[in-house]
């Protein structure tokens, strides 16, 4: 516990002190006091440097003195033989004796008292920045006028902080400018402008004179500008070293002026003003800015329009332009929006065709549609090449956005029929020779596929069964083969209006207009064994001449069988109608004269016994197209005949093309259009 005074005596004092002793005393007086230690008696064995016996006085780490021998006072009015004055409040006294004393030594008597210290003068480091005031047990600092004492109670500074500038224009200077600025001060000035305006600071070089930097380049006094996370400075020296125009990009600016204790100069003066916050003229690819300006500032609005082929995608909605506003923070609104290449998406698939998976579906990409060759071709032209257009659609030069349509190739058998003389007198055939051949099982008859949805046959085939079961794609017509072939389901039967319906069809003598169409429920898929036959053109090129050859096919009666199991075919010449008239009817149901012959009928056959017969009805009489030798068209349909193995009569299809086209158009489905 600190005391104001005390006594220290060597062991056994005033008797002789013993040998081999080491004793220490820790003296402590209250803080703010020094210690006055004085000896009134000193009798200790003398030795060089007091090596044998001694009393040692230590202050902190410093030895203040080491005493031995005998001392007497120099002043007759004072008993003090030795004294020490320390400006600290702690002191240590240590007494040591060695193992022997040649004489009897009595030791020492000492006293200490707490003494006032003058902190203002007693130390190298001055405790106060300005005025120091000593008092017993302490000191206090004070400041000149206009200065105030900082919280550390030692340093004085001017009260230059707390000013907030909100005007759009203003001037700020260091304290006392142009007189020397106060030392040891930190001045903080705040500029706070309306959002959307940036603080722009302007200085003149000559309006700045601040204590220069030290040899390491560190400013001793400094001026710093802080705008958000950006800092300008520190600045110091004679003449402003920074840019004379500082665009802070912020509406808030803190100005910090820090001075030390020495080297005061005239200081600084600056002007500031609020500029509408500029927004950068960004390089937004693939777009145009409207209006175009050299500089955009707070509240400016631009319309950013994408170039052709580019779009702004926001969520699921694509747009060609957007508005952007220069915001108070110097950033554009909608800055995340970009003009991206238009994406036309995965191209739509088409029936009976395909499109290769595109490498890209973006603007400018090219895709190619192809039809499933050789069974389908592109009906509506355009070549099948589409490019991704600016409006986000796949576009063809000819068709625009309309998709190509793959329609069946007509009249081209996968394998040509090689005629072998063996229908009546005909040959075995493969369905690939006659892929248009349709089999009707009730009645046992034939028909011709003319497109995906329509079968052409004879009226007398369907007059008794308006819901015929039909098959395509099979050479043989055993039940098991038909089960594996394609069955066609009728939707509606259209018999030519000129066909006379009879109550007893078996007695028919008039086969004029023996033609009918069957509309199918579902489209037929074409392939090597299923493919339509062409219809005749309406030009005179399609008028048949006597001797013109045509092919007939079917599963009708042969020389050996009532019904063929495997498809049969024969090549027949067209003959004059009179040749058919001249043949005697095999099993007449009326007078020979009752049988009607009209220009709607073709007579053919008579050569090598080749003819169509019962069960072949409705099948096509296929003739090579005069304008395209690779194709066959249905010139006729097996209708009737006087006698198998002679001449047969065929419905002249050319005379019914208008009716066929009209019927199909009026009864087509939307997906077929």
């Amino acid at each position: 516990e600190p005391t104001m005074y005390g006594e220290i005596l060597s062991p056994n004092y005033p008797q002789a002190y013993p040998s081999e002793v080491e004793k220490s005393w820790d003296i402590e007086v209250p803080e703010g006091y020094g210690i006055h230690l004085y000896f009134t008696h000193l009798d200790i064995e003398l030795s060089e440097n007091c090596a044998y016996d001694s009393v040692q006085i230590i202050s902190g780490d410093t030895e203040e003195g080491r005493l031995c021998g005998q001392r007497s006072s120099n002043n007759p009015h004072s008993p003090i033989v030795e004294e020490f004055q320390v400006p600290y409040n702690k002191l240590q006294v240590i007494f040591k004796s060695d193992f022997s004393n040649e004489e009897r030594f009595t030791g020492f008597a000492a006293y200490y008292v707490a003494t006032d210290i003058n902190e203002c003068t007693d130390f190298v480091d001055v405790p106060c920045s300005h005025f120091c005031n000593n008092f017993i047990g302490g000191y206090f600092c004070s400041c000149p006028p206009e200065y105030f004492l900082h919280d550390d109670m030692k340093n004085c500074g001017v009260n230059c902080s707390g000013d907030v500038f909100t005007a759009l224009i203003g001037e700020i200077a260091s304290p006392n400018y142009p007189k020397p600025y106060p030392e040891n001060s930190r001045c903080e000035y705040q500029i706070r402008l309306e959002k959307g305006f940036q603080v722009v600071v302007t200085l003149r070089r000559e309006d700045f004179d601040v204590e220069a930097a030290d040899s390491a380049g560190n400013c001793l006094d400094s001026l710093v500008f802080v705008a958000g996370d950006r800092q300008f400075g520190p600045y110091c020296g004679h003449g402003f070293p920074g840019p004379l125009n500082i665009e802070t990009k912020s509406n808030a600016l803190d100005i910090i002026f820090q001075t030390d204790l020495t080297g005061q100069k005239k200081g600084w003066k600056l002007r500031y003003h609020g500029d509408p916050m500029p927004c950068p003229k960004e390089d937004t690819p693939n777009s145009v800015w409207e209006p175009a300006k050299a500089k955009y500032v707070f509240r400016d609005v631009v319309q950013i329009t994408c170039l052709d082929g580019f779009e702004v995608v926001e969520g699921r909605v694509g747009a060609t332009s957007f508005y952007s506003t220069c915001q108070s923070n110097g950033k554009w609104s909608n800055s995340k929006l970009k003009c991206q290449p238009v994406d036309c998406g995965i191209p739509e698939s088409i029936e009976n065709g395909k499109v290769e998976d595109p490498e890209s579906t973006l603007f400018g990409s090219v895709i190619r549609y192809t039809c499933e060759e050789p069974y389908y071709y592109m009906e509506n032209g355009g070549g099948g090449e589409y490019h991704c257009a600016g409006n986000g659609s796949w576009v063809n030069e000819v068709l625009g956005p309309e998709l190509p349509k793959c329609v069946p190739v007509c009249g081209v058998p996968r394998e040509p029929f090689e005629e072998k003389q063996r229908i009546i007198g005909g040959s075995d055939a493969d369905i690939k020779n006659f892929p248009w051949q349709v089999f009707f099982d009730n009645p046992w008859a034939g028909g011709a596929l003319i497109n995906e949805y329509w079968v052409l046959t004879a009226a007398h085939v369907v007059e008794g069964n308006r819901e015929p079961t039909m098959y395509v794609g099979s050479t043989s017509v055993q039940t098991s083969r038909l089960a594996k072939s394609k069955m066609l389901t009728p939707e509606h039967v259209f018999i030519h209006p000129g066909w006379k319906l009879l109550e007893v069809p078996e007695g028919r003598t008039n086969f004029d207009n023996d033609i009918a169409l069957v509309r199918l429920k579902d489209p037929v898929k074409m392939g090597p064994t299923v493919s339509p036959i062409c219809l005749p053109g309406t030009s005179s090129d399609y008028n048949l001449m006597d001797g013109d050859l045509g092919l007939i096919s079917g599963w009708g009666r042969t020389e050996k069988r009532d019904r063929a199991v495997r498809l049969k075919a024969a090549r027949l010449p067209v003959a004059p109608l009179r040749k058919c008239k001249e043949v005697k009817v095999e099993k007449p149901t009326a007078d020979a004269e009752a049988y009607v012959f009209t220009p709607n009928m073709i007579c053919a056959g008579g050569e090598k016994g080749m003819d169509s017969c019962k069960g072949d009805s409705g099948g096509a009489f296929a003739v090579q197209d005069p304008n395209d030798k690779t194709k066959f068209y249905a010139a006729g349909l097996v209708s009737w005949g006087p006698q198998c193995g002679t001449y047969g009569l065929y419905t002249r299809v050319k005379n019914y093309v208008d009716w066929i086209m009209k019927t199909m158009q009026e009864n087509s489905t939307p997906r077929e259009d």
């Epitope: 072998k420 075995d428 055939a429 493969d430 050479t475 055993q478 050996k560 199991v565 495997r566």
Partner: antibody, heavy 118, light 107 residues
């Protein structure tokens, strides 16, 4: 007159191959569907394979599918049967037959014997 | 596959006898059936096609009948040259199949 002559038969080890030929004459070969039919010693007839006039359509018995291949060369009036991966159960007299019309075999060859044995 | 069951597998009859062979299909084959005759060491010969049609040049003592699954082959008056094995053959579906054969002998 119509003649069908088979050749190419003989002794072969199991797993081996043989190619049978059938030379046709006396009729228009390309006019007819053709078949191979076999008869194991002392057993009944077994249909093996069938080919259309042009050669584009072919059918096989389950027992030979994937191992035997039927083909024809209309220019040479010849029918062929390539037999691979032969097994002991393929031992038989192999006939080529003309399908007169609708699966009725009206003309047959004299047959060629194929023996599969190790 | 369509199985063709022929019976009897063999028979012995006298010259002039009426001989009947039956063939049963494992499923309906309509009239898609032929009958063949094979003499020892010879190739088969077509006798009847489409179940009941007599092939050109075949003696009229041979006949066939039936439809669906049950078929009959008849020799109205057995002759010595008729000694042979007779096979039925269906062509309704692939694979084409033959009956096991009926061996006809003279008593």
């Amino acid at each position: 007159q119509v003649q069908l002559v088979e050749s190419g038969g003989g002794l072969v080890k199991p797993g081996g191959s043989l190619r049978l030929s059938c030379a046709a004459s006396g009729f228009t070969f390309s006019d007819y569907y053709m078949s191979w039919i076999r008869q194991a010693p002392g057993k009944g007839l077994e249909w093996v394979s069938y080919i259309s006039r042009s050669g584009s359509t072919k059918y096989y018995a389950h027992s030979v599918k994937g191992r035997f291949t039927i083909s024809r060369d209309n220019a040479k009036n010849s029918l062929y049967l390539q037999m691979n991966s032969l097994r002991a159960e393929d031992t038989a007299v192999y006939y080529c037959a003309r399908d007169e019309t609708d699966y009725a075999y009206d003309e047959w060859g004299q047959g060629t014997l194929v023996t599969v044995s190790s | 596959d369509i199985q063709m069951t022929q019976s009897p597998s063999s028979l012995s009859a006298s010259v002039g006898d009426r001989v009947t062979i039956t063939c049963q299909a494992s499923q309906d084959i309509s009239n898609y059936l032929n009958w063949y005759q094979q003499k020892p060491g010879k190739a088969p010969k077509l006798l009847i096609y489409d179940a009941s049609n007599l092939e050109t040049g075949v003696p009229s003592r041979f006949s066939g009948s039936g439809s669906g699954t049950d078929f009959t082959f008849t020799i109205s008056s057995l002759q010595p040259e008729d000694i042979a094995t007779y096979y039925c053959h269906q062509y309704e579906d692939y694979p084409l199949t033959f009956g096991g054969g009926t061996k006809v002998e003279i008593k």
